[in-house]
Structure formats: structure tokens, C-alpha cells
């Protein structure tokens, strides 16, 4: 049987009286081994026959003395089997063996949990020679024990290629509970139950857990470690911790904050990065996420023109990268822009609205009803048209660009004319007779040149022909009309 040494047990601070796992009353030691060092050692208990060699792992020497008497089997003497002490206390324990003097170079090594202890340990071996035998005492001391010193210690000695092994000495370092799992911060949905876990170990066991929420004890009766607390739901942020109690006292975990998920705050600092005629690139700074990751954002765009119908265009985008290009806008228009983002709980309010404008663009349509006719008397070609609708001018008209291409007998020549925005007619000189003139017109703004109208062709005869009816822009679906005069 393993014998035990133990420090005086202190009563459980919260639960006096018998309870599961309580320490038994200490026994008076049968034998207290002396120690030269100055620290207060743990008490050590030895069996009733301290000097009796054990029959475990023994070496029977083959050498005999002069009288030819066989030598007794070699074995470590029994010593204390179990030492219980508090963290940071000192401890010293030993192995002893009597070895016949015929054996030379006997060394004792210390092993812990199957691994040899080398180097920075306080192991001392003392030899006490006598006429026939030498008593060897190997001492092992630890000045300030830690939990990592817990374990089973043995001595080993090699003689005659035989290994002699001592009985184990179990060291049990007791202290305040040590957390192996503490509650963790969480973000939770309002009024929804969730779990927190707390686990602590001794020795000594048992370790009992109390939960604390906002400084109030949740469970007035302890729960054995590990403990899972089901929190029935929160309406506001709370701080939780757990207390771990054992016979040595209590340890308190870190306090963790449990936040309640909420809708996000509105984005801030919505700003214009770039504007074109039909798009605006915006960026924003997200608001507080409400303890729940953003999922996506919504850009709301409404025309700032007081005469507009006030309809809102909505563009959805991912929450990152806080940047969005709003497309399909009208040129030279004013818009109010707001941004809202959502998490799993819901949508934020809309950011403060900002005003933004698109720039001028090139017109999106060509001039309408283009007609061309030959004024032979002045040797000119007259061109007339209607300006594009204001909505589709995409800016302020600064004029028109007229392209006229002259083709005859394998020769082709394109000329461009710029005319001012006033009026809707132009006159160009005949460049070549007996040729086809193809005319196209585009509207021009500061934003650029719009599309050209469909081509209108007119044949310019040789000199002396009569001025006939004009050519005009065809109806949709008709291919290049040619009026031959």
C-alpha cells in the first residue's frame, strides 16, 4: 500500500462539514525523516517497517565472500510513498540502499515519470562506508515546487548489468484551482439563450465552480468543474466570470464581456471620389457594426432637382470595400446620395445625405430629321436638321460637327465642318461635281461629340442640271437613300 504524507488540510472555505471529496483527517506521522536544510519540509509517512528491503526489483550478486557465504539480494529500502504539499513549498526526499563494498562505481540516477532527470536538479548522493557495506543515500530536493513537479519519482542503480529500481515516490503539488478553460467574450442576439464554459483543476480536487454575472452570483450552489452555464438571454451588455474553489482557496477567471448584437450605426463620411457624365464613384466610412459583421450596403440615389418625381434608385453592394460606382445616371444632373448598411440584425439608418453632380457628357443622340438639298445657283449644298431632345443632349450644346464625304470615279474625300449651336442649318460648298455627297451630323457639347446621324446622300450632277427636291434622313429601316437629280 502507498503511504501518504500530507500538509495539514484546511477546511473548505465555503462549505464546512463533510462533503464529497473532502480531505480525511491527517494521521500522526509514524516516522519523520530529518532534514538538514532550512525549509519546512512536508510531513512524510513511512510504513511500519522502515528498514525492510522490498522484494520488487532486486539484484542477487553471484560473488561470494572468503567464507563463501552468498551476498544478500540488493534492493532500495522502503521510503515515503506519497508526499502532498502546497505550491511554492520546498520538498526533499531520498532513496537509500546498502551495497557490499566489493562493488565499485555505483551511481544512482533519478527518474520522473519514466524520464531521467538530468542537469539542473538538486540531487545529492552521500556514501557512508562500513566494514562490509556502504550505505548510499540519494537525496532529491526542490526548493519551490510547482504543479509541473507533480509525478512519480524513482531511483535507479546499475550493478553487474542489473538494474535496481526503487519504489515510486509520488509527489502531489496542491494549490489554488488552475483554469484550463475560461469563459470567452461573445456577441449574442438579444433575449436568446447561450452557453459559457468554465473548467478548472486542482489538485486538490474537487474543484467547484460559481458563476458571477455583473457582480451577482448566478448559482448559489457550486457546480463541479467543468461547468456550463446556460444564460437565459440578455437585454444589455453583461460581464461574466467564474470562481473556482478547492480546499486551498479560490481563483477567479478573467471577466468577459457579452455584447448584444444590434443594428449597425449609419455610415459616416460619404464622399465623392470621382464623377463622370453617367456615373459617380462614392466611398464611405462604415459605422459601428453593432457587434455583428456587415453583410451588405445599399446606396440610395435621388434626383436633387425639385421638379423631379422624387423617386429613389437603390443599388445594393457588398459591405467591402466601402466603395461603389453608381452608374446609369444622367449627365449634368444633381443627385442626393445616402448609404445604409446591414448586419444579421437589420439595416442601419441612412447616412447623412450628400449632394453630387454628374459632369457634362457627349450627347447621347444625333440631330433629328436631317435634310440635304442642292442649291445649284450658288453651287452649295444646304443642310437642315432638328436639335436632339434636351434630356439627351447630356450637356450644353456648343455646336455641331458635319461630316460630308464626296465620292466619284474611285475618289473619296471626307471633310468636317464645325458650326455654332445657334440655328439648325448649314451650307457647304460643292466640292466635286458628278459625285455623291454623303452627309452626317453630330451634336457637340463640352463633354464631347455625340453620335452621328444616319447618312443622307445626294448626287451632285455636272454643271447645268436643275435643282430638284432635297434628300432627307430616311425613316427607320431604310438603307442609304440616294436622290439622283
Amino acid at each position: 500500500a502507498i503511504t501518504e504524507a500530507r500538509e495539514e488540510a484546511k477546511p473548505y472555505p465555503l462549505f464546512p462539514g463533510p462533503f464529497p471529496g473532502s480531505l480525511q483527517t491527517d494521521h500522526t506521522p509514524l516516522l519523520s525523516l530529518p532534514h538538514a536544510s532550512g525549509y519546512q519540509p512536508a510531513l512524510m509517512f513511512s510504513p511500519t517497517q522502515p528498514g525492510r528491503p522490498h522484494t520488487g526489483n532486486v539484484a542477487i550478486p553471484q560473488v561470494t565472500s572468503v567464507e563463501s557465504k552468498p551476498l544478500p539480494p540488493l534492493a532500495f529500502k522502503h521510503t515515503v510513498g506519497h508526499i502532498i504539499l502546497s505550491e511554492h513549498k520546498g520538498v526533499k526526499f531520498n532513496c537509500s540502499i546498502s551495497v557490499p563494498n566489493i562493488y565499485q562505481d555505483t551511481t544512482i540516477s533519478w527518474w520522473k515519470d519514466g524520464k531521467e532527470l538530468l542537469g539542473a536538479h538538486h540531487a545529492i548522493t552521500q556514501f557512508y562506508p562500513d566494514d562490509e557495506v556502504t550505505a548510499i543515500i540519494a537525496s532529491f530536493s526542490i526548493t519551490s515546487v510547482q504543479r509541473s513537479d507533480n509525478g512519480s519519482y524513482i531511483c535507479k542503480m546499475k550493478i553487474n548489468n542489473e538494474e535496481i529500481v526503487s519504489d515510486p515516490i509520488y509527489i502531489e503539488v496542491q494549490g489554488l484551482p488552475h483554469f484550463t478553460k475560461q469563459p470567452e467574450s461573445m456577441n449574442v442576439t438579444r433575449n436568446t439563450a447561450f452557453n459559457l464554459t468554465c473548467q478548472a483543476v486542482g489538485p486538490p480536487e474537487p474543484v467547484n465552480i460559481f458563476w458571477v454575472q455583473n457582480s451577482s452570483r448566478v448559482n448559489e450552489q457550486p457546480e463541479k468543474s467543468p461547468s456550463v452555464l446556460t444564460v437565459p438571454g440578455l437585454t444589455e451588455m453583461a460581464v461574466f466570470s467564474c470562481e473556482a474553489h478547492n480546499d486551498k482557496g479560490l481563483t477567479v477567471s478573467k471577466g468577459v464581456q457579452i455584447n448584444i448584437k444590434a443594428i449597425p450605426s449609419p455610415p459616416t463620411e460619404v464622399s465623392i471620389r470621382n464623377s463622370t457624365a453617367h456615373s459617380i464613384l462614392i466611398s464611405w466610412v462604415p459605422g459601428f457594426d453593432g457587434y455583428s459583421p456587415f453583410r451588405n450596403c445599399s446606396i440610395q440615389v435621388k434626383e436633387a432637382d425639385p421638379l423631379s418625381n422624387g423617386s429613389v434608385m437603390i443599388f445594393n453592394t457588398s459591405a467591402l470595400p466601402h466603395l461603389y460606382q453608381i452608374k446609369q445616371l444622367q449627365a449634368l444632373a444633381n443627385y442626393s446620395i445616402g448609404v445604409s448598411c446591414m448586419n444579421e440584425i437589420g439595416w442601419s439608418a441612412v447616412s447623412p445625405w450628400i449632394l453630387a453632380s454628374t459632369t457634362e457628357g457627349a450627347p447621347s443622340v444625333a440631330p433629328l430629321n436631317v435634310t440635304v438639298f442642292l442649291n445649284e445657283s450658288s453651287d452649295n449644298v444646304d443642310i437642315r436638321w432638328m436639335k436632339p431632345p434636351t434630356k439627351q443632349q447630356d450637356g450644353e450644346l456648343v455646336g455641331y460637327r458635319i461630316s460630308h464625304v464626296w465620292q466619284s470615279a474611285g475618289i473619296s474625300k471626307e471633310l468636317l465642318e464645325e458650326v455654332g449651336q445657334n440655328g439648325s442649318r448649314a451650307r457647304i460648298s460643292v466640292q466635286v461635281h458628278n459625285a455623291t455627297c454623303t452627309v452626317r451630323i453630330a451634336a457637340v457639347t463640352r463633354g464631347g461629340v455625340g453620335p452621328f446621324s444616319d447618312p443622307v446622300k445626294i448626287f451632285i450632277p455636272a454643271h447645268g442640271w436643275v435643282d430638284y427636291a432635297p434628300s432627307s434622313t430616311p425613316a427607320p429601316g431604310n438603307a442609304d437613300p440616294v436622290l439622283i437629280i
Partner: antibody
Framework: QVQLVQSGSELKKPGASVKVSCKAS????????LSWVRQAPGQGLEWMGW????????TYTDDFKGRFVFSLDTNVSTAYLQISSLKAEDTAVYYC???????????WGQGTLVTVSS | DIQLTQSPSFLSASVGDRVTITCRAS?????MHWYQQKPGKAPKLLIY???NLAQGVPSRFSGSGSGTGFTLTISSLQPEDFATYYC?????????FGQGTKLEIK
């Protein structure tokens, strides 16, 4: 199923003592605390305190310190309330209630009427 | 000690009515529990931790609130709901009960 069964009604003279029992069944007795609640005739509920069934340690509220004693016999899963030096104003129904996390009294005994009258 | 004040103390209502009982705490509490007591019977847990229905309690009962203000609502009164209702706080020892609200048939 969880049950708390209390002892029957008591009629006592002033100055006497009474001991009310509360026997628990349907759960592990030592895992939940036991509270005692008083209800005077026509009045509301008053929490008297509780006993830790794990350690046997009682806790009393200020109004119930002195003449009131909570005790246990864990072998028979029973809690006791003893009142000594009874007064007329101790006349009330006394309830035991199982006491869980967050101070919830989730199961109640049927109540014991203690009448103190000369 | 934290004082709990229930209002109203008496309430007359008819079957099918929606009724709300309020419990106000003298200082902030963590949770409020609600109990129902019928004459000559022990109290019965109705709602725990402000808004959680106890086992077997019909869904017409609901609870809400935080801090110092809490409510118990019965969405559509049934004949078996006529009783006295008590609130009880958790968050500060000693635990205290409200004075009760007696719900009577109109």
C-alpha cells in the same frame, strides 16, 4: 417528476416551537438549493432565505435571523424549517421551493399552514 | 433591499382581454421572474429571466423589460388565468417579491 412534499398544518401556542419538513423527490437533492418563503394570511410572498443542500450551510434574510433555523437530512432528501419561541405574527403558510440559477424558484411545496394561537 | 412595486394591485378584466402587469424596481436588476398563485395553492413559476416561458406555460403569457421596468402580458385572457401574479427580482440579495397583482373577472 420533481416534487416537494411538505408536512401538514400545525396549531401551536405562543412560545412553542414547530418543525416543518419538505421532502424532495425526482432530482438529485444536493444539486439544488432549497428556499423557504412565508406568506402571512392575505399577504404577499416573503423570501426567508435558503439552505445549501451541498454543504448544509443556511443563509437567512435579516427579518428571519434568530428564531428560524434551516436544516437538512440529505439521507432522506429532506429540508426542515424550525421556528422557536413562536409568536402570533408567525401565523402564515410556509413554502419550500427549489432554488436554481438566477434565483429562480422553479418548484414549490404545497405549503404548510402554521397557526400560532393561545 | 430592492423594492418591487407592481401596478395595478387589482385588475378587473374579461375573458379574451389583453392585460399587462407592470413591475418597477427601486434600482436596476438583472432579471425578473413571474409567478402565478391561485387561492389556497402554492405559487407556480410562469416566466423566468424576464422573458422565458417556464415549462408547460401557455404562449399567451409573455414577459419583457430591463433595468428597472418589467412587464407581464397575457395576450388573451382565459378563465384559468384569474389569479394573483407576483414578480421577483434577481440581481441583488436578498431576492424580493412584488406585493402582487390580483386579476379578477369583470
Amino acid at each position: 417528476q420533481v416534487q416537494l412534499v411538505q408536512s401538514g398544518s400545525e396549531l401551536k401556542k405562543p412560545g412553542a416551537s414547530v418543525k416543518v419538513s419538505c421532502k424532495a423527490s425526482g432530482y438529485i437533492f444536493t444539486t439544488y438549493g432549497l428556499s423557504w418563503v412565508r406568506q402571512a394570511p392575505g399577504q404577499g410572498l416573503e423570501w426567508m432565505g435558503w439552505i445549501n443542500t451541498y454543504s448544509g450551510v443556511p443563509t437567512y434574510t435579516d427579518d428571519f435571523k434568530g428564531r428560524f433555523v434551516f436544516s437538512l437530512d440529505t439521507n432522506v432528501s429532506t429540508a426542515y424549517l424550525q421556528i422557536s419561541s413562536l409568536k402570533a405574527e408567525d401565523t402564515a403558510v410556509y413554502y419550500c421551493a427549489r432554488y436554481t440559477n438566477y434565483g429562480v424558484f422553479d418548484y414549490w411545496g404545497q405549503g404548510t399552514l402554521v397557526t400560532v394561537s393561545s | 433591499d430592492i423594492q418591487l412595486t407592481q401596478s395595478p394591485s387589482f385588475l378587473s378584466a374579461s375573458v379574451g382581454d389583453r392585460v399587462t402587469i407592470t413591475c418597477r424596481a427601486s434600482s436596476s436588476v438583472g432579471y425578473m421572474h413571474w409567478y402565478q398563485q391561485k387561492p389556497g395553492k402554492a405559487p407556480k413559476l410562469l416566466i423566468y429571466a424576464t422573458s422565458n416561458l417556464a415549462q408547460g406555460v401557455p404562449s399567451r403569457f409573455s414577459g419583457s423589460g430591463s433595468g428597472t421596468g418589467f412587464t407581464l402580458t397575457i395576450s388573451s385572457l382565459q378563465p384559468e388565468d384569474f389569479a394573483t401574479y407576483y414578480c421577483q427580482q434577481w440581481g441583488s440579495l436578498p431576492f424580493t417579491f412584488g406585493q402582487g397583482t390580483k386579476l379578477e373577472i369583470k
